[in-house]
């Protein structure tokens, strides 16, 4: 089996649809399977067509998390198997743009996932770069939240608070509604005190390219780039 057209990597916005193409040939005509982060693809639709010993497979995905997608073409000639692989990464453009570019509005949090974490009647920043900011941000939290089910009892509440306060940032109302980022110190506390082991595992896997964790890419800010609580009492949100 030989791959003629490998799937292409994409950097897309959260909630986009992406179609990955994989074309292979061989005698006999190979079969194509798709793998997502090392496992069989759990969601998405696959369409295939065969023409002149060439198989074309299209995997359509609704993107809610980053991933490594591998196209595997296999055929069997007698007792001998022949396999060809090609991979593509789907990464998500960071939802939270630099503050000066932020366009959005302040509103009370009305979602469910962060109910126990965010203060009652919390005023949060909703990002209008989404068609439906409330739904998109809630879905973003929900997707990352599922990953937190496997972390330690010490890490989980801290990571949940970080996640909710990062995606639904405190909002400072005014002529230009402004999101208030989490203080660097709280981010570091989660990274180094509460979730040290989990963070190390996550970063190691990311470096090795095994998978791109949604917790890492979407919900965890880069601590060093956040404002410090020692700058100004209003520079950031103390959790």
């Amino acid at each position: 089996a030989r791959i003629l057209r490998a799937p292409e990597s994409h950097n897309v916005t959260f909630g986009s649809f992406v179609t990955l193409h994989c074309t292979a040939t061989g005698i006999p005509v190979p079969t194509i399977t798709w793998i997502e982060n090392g496992n069989a693809v759990s969601s998405g639709s696959i369409q295939e067509s065969v023409k002149d010993r060439v198989i074309d497979s299209r995997l359509q995905l609704f993107i809610t998390k980053p991933g490594l997608y591998t196209c595997i073409a296999t055929n069997k000639h007698g007792e001998k198997f022949s396999t060809a692989k090609a991979a593509a990464t789907i990464s998500i453009a960071e939802w939270s743009k630099p503050q000066k570019d932020n366009k959005g509005y302040c509103a009370q949090y009305r979602g469910e996932v962060c109910n126990a974490v965010l203060a009652k009647d919390a005023l949060v920043f909703l990002n209008t770069s989404y068609a439906d900011p409330e739904e998109a941000q809630e879905l973003l939290v929900h997707t990352a939240w599922n990953e937190l089910k496997v972390v330690s009892p010490v890490c989980r509440p801290a990571a949940e608070a970080l996640l909710c306060n990062h995606i639904f940032q405190e909002c400072s109302p005014g002529v230009v509604p402004t999101p208030i980022p989490i203080c660097r110190e709280y981010c570091l506390a989660v990274k180094e005190l509460f979730c040290a082991k989990e963070w190390l595992v996550m970063e190691e896997k990311t470096h090795r390219g095994l998978y791109r964790s949604e917790m890492h890419l979407l919900s965890v800010p880069e601590c060093s780039k956040l404002p410090s609580m020692h700058w100004d009492p209003t520079a950031c949100a103390r959790l």
């Epitope: 405190e170 110190e185 570091l188 100004d232």
Partner: antibody, heavy 118, light 112 residues
Framework: EVQLVQSGAEVKKPGESLKISCKGS????????IGWVRQMPGKGLEWMGI????????RYSPSFQGQVTISADKSISTAYLQWSSLKASDTAMYYC???????????WGQGTLVTVSS | DIVMTQSPLSLPVIPGEPASISCRSS???????????LDWYLQKPGQSPQLLIY???NRASGVPDRFSGSGSGTDFTLKISRVEAEDVGVYYC?????????FGQGTKLEIK
Amino acid sequence: EVQLVQSGAEVKKPGESLKISCKGSGYSFTSYWIGWVRQMPGKGLEWMGIIYPGDSDTRYSPSFQGQVTISADKSISTAYLQWSSLKASDTAMYYCARHSHWGFLDYWGQGTLVTVSS
Amino acid sequence: DIVMTQSPLSLPVIPGEPASISCRSSQSLLQSNGYNYLDWYLQKPGQSPQLLIYLGSNRASGVPDRFSGSGSGTDFTLKISRVEAEDVGVYYCMQVQQTPYTFGQGTKLEIK
């Protein structure tokens, strides 16, 4: 075990320069702010300023701005407090302390006694 | 700057009796997260200061439970339920709400 070890006592003359040190160990030195606190003989504690060794960002108390310089060398996990021209009124015990991620000073050095006398 | 005012400045106590130190700030130390950015430290004779209470009411690791912190906004209290001889020293409150961080003048606790 988290430790902050300060350099030894110093006796100087007015007008001389001085740099005292505070070496951190047992934790991620670049992730925590280090503060300096002055205690003049028989007096209370005064917060002088802080440094974030990760990027050498500093914040000074207005009372000490321009009087001292706070710096750090993250490669050797050490923070410094220095004077370019000492005065008799700089005679004091100087403590370095680590600001926890919640702001409080959770670990303190043993203190460096600086005596400035002609 | 936020001014921290402690009282009394001197506190003679009989061992086994309770003791209370007050600390008042010129501005509220209560943050939107519900925490008061007020800490208490004890400096024993000839030693470096040590953390007793952080964020208004949380006892630091290794601090005996006879020590407790309370209060909110601008008025705070450190209580020792039963004073022991080892509790002698100078007690300081400190605000970490905004820089420059400031300490109270200190309260000297001595045994009667």
